[in-house]
């Protein structure tokens, strides 16, 4: 099953190009900008997102850390380097030879530097905190109803077992979402908390990547839940490597 | 409130399919996942595999892959589970399973099918 | 493929009395504090209900002398006090992993 048979689109990212020339007629799709072909049954990796994404304006923002390791994408859009898995290779470099190295969402963990530069391994983002605020509603939502409400929602629509949600904090406004998956964790097949927190990132947005669905209507007890804003932050298995001259 | 309501009993041959449906009410159909659980006469439960309602794909439990087949529905809100080159070990209850909201845990089942293989 | 054995097959317990039924699985099915192993109650003729979730949270409409406790991989089904009504058997599951797996069932009967 890699796409929607009948009329050849991709559920899972309407940023490809589908036709029927797979083994036996079957749908196969590509995403743009790579031209790899994508498996429409799950999540596409964000690094063939940004890739196709790259026509798009540039997205910077500053946050506030909630660790000393927590990393945050202040650098926005670029067109990162994929390998042939679709994942983020771990030097990225610029067309003005700048390079830099890579987590495996793609946020900058080094000091930028020359084609000199060297990224030994792409380092996993093995904890992601993703930090909502709602907009005001008659009260707060019910916190044991929230938590099964965005579990649900992980599961369902960005595929990822919920046991990779290890918690959902509240204290209105704010509601907090904690995704974590260690390496020995991760089975074939699993998404990727990553590519499921980028999915999410751009629903909230109003920016879905999904093909032909409506965008996303959160609602907790039937009470729309209402994001006005999300910071996320990214952990490494490896804290980063910044100089000091980056963190005064 | 959320029902399952599951299609009537079956008596097949040896080597015969059969489809078992499912029809969802009570709830937004596409919103949760469906579960297929089989229980074998005085036997306990077997998971059998699961369906994306959202997607259409399915997850098999591999002692029934290439034997088992999960679709839906959403004009009718229904989900079908055939099961193929059937045997006698094969007679059983087989019920379906709404997922819960948090845990995967199983929060709403059908009334079960009983199907019968029986030369 | 995780196993769960449950303890004990059959037990009979007098009206009023506590009720514990165990299950042991063959690895942990904790995640970050979030264990994926449930119970369910089966009558003659019905379907399973879900009882307990994510091994201590009673599912709505579930009579609250029904506990569960336990993490990792021992966990325990408590009836605080038995009634003429809960005579079935009971199943734990686990959907941490693909397969997901039951328990053989435990037979509950009033002595």
């Known amino acids: 099953h890699t796409a929607a048979q009948d009329n050849c689109t991709c559920p899972t990212n309407k940023m490809t190009v589908c036709s029927p020339d797979g083994p036996g007629g079957r749908c196969q799709c590509r995403a743009l900008g790579s031209g790899m072909a994508v498996d429409c049954s799950t999540l596409t990796s964000k690094c063939l997102l940004l890739k196709a994404r790259m026509s798009a304006p540039k997205n910077a923002r500053t946050l506030v850390r909630p660790s000393e390791h927590a990393l945050v994408d202040n650098d926005g859009l670029y067109d990162p380097d994929c390998d042939p898995e679709g994942r983020f290779k771990a030097r990225q470099c610029n067309q003005t030879s700048v390079c830099w190295c890579v987590n495996s969402v793609g946020v900058r963990r080094t000091d930028k530097g020359d084609l000199s530069l060297r990224c030994d391994e792409l380092v996993r983002t093995h904890h992601i905190l993703i930090d909502l605020r709602h907009r005001p509603t008659a009260g707060a939502f019910n916190h044991s109803d929230l938590d099964a409400e965005l579990r649900r929602l992980f599961r369902e629509r960005y595929r990822l077992h919920p046991k990779f949600v290890a918690a959902v904090h509240y204290e209105q406004p704010t509601i907090q979402i904690e995704l974590r998956q260690n390496t020995s964790q991760k089975a074939a097949g699993d998404v990727d908390i990553g590519d499921a927190a980028y999915y999410f990132e751009r629903d909230i947005k109003g920016e879905s990547l999904f093909q032909g669905r409506g965008g996303l209507d959160l609602r907790v007890r039937g009470e729309p839940l209402q994001v006005e804003r999300t910071l996320i932050y990214y952990l490494d298995e490896i804290p980063p490597k910044f100089s000091m001259k980056r963190l005064t | 409130q959320v029902q399952l309501v599951q299609s009537g009993a079956e008596v097949k041959k040896p080597g015969a399919s059969v489809k078992v449906s499912c029809k969802a009410s009570?709830?937004?159909?596409?919103?949760?996942?469906i579960n297929w659980v089989r229980q074998a006469p005085g036997q306990g439960l077997e998971w059998m595999g699961v369906i994306s309602t959202y997607y259409g794909d399915a997850s098999y439990n591999q002692k029934f892959k290439g034997r088992v087949t999960m679709t839906r529905d959403t004009s009718t809100s229904t989900v079908y589970m055939e099961l193929s080159s059937l045997r006698s070990e094969d007679t059983a209850v087989y019920y379906c399973?709404?997922?819960?909201?948090?845990?995967?845990?199983?929060?709403?089942w059908g009334q079960g099918t009983l199907v019968t293989v029986s030369s | 493929d995780i196993v769960m054995t449950q303890s004990p097959d059959s037990l009979a317990v007098s009206l009023g009395e506590r009720a514990t039924i165990n299950c042991r699985v063959s690895?942990?099915?904790?995640?970050?504090?979030?264990?994926?192993m449930h119970w369910y109650q089966q009558k003659p003729g019905q379907p399973p209900k879900l009882l307990i979730y994510r091994a201590s949270n009673l599912e709505s409409g579930v009579p609250d002398r029904f506990s569960g406790s336990g993490s990792g991989t021992d966990f325990t089904l408590t009836i605080s006090s038995l009634q003429a009504e809960d005579v079935a058997v009971y199943y734990c599951q686990q959907s941490y992993e693909d397969p997901y797996t039951f328990g053989q069932g435990t037979k509950l009967e009033i002595k």
């Open positions: 009570g709830y937004t159909f596409t919103d949760y996942s």
């Open positions: 690895e942990s099915v904790d995640s970050y504090g979030n264990n994926f």
């Open positions: 399973a709404r997922y819960g909201d948090g845990y995967n845990q199983f929060d709403y």
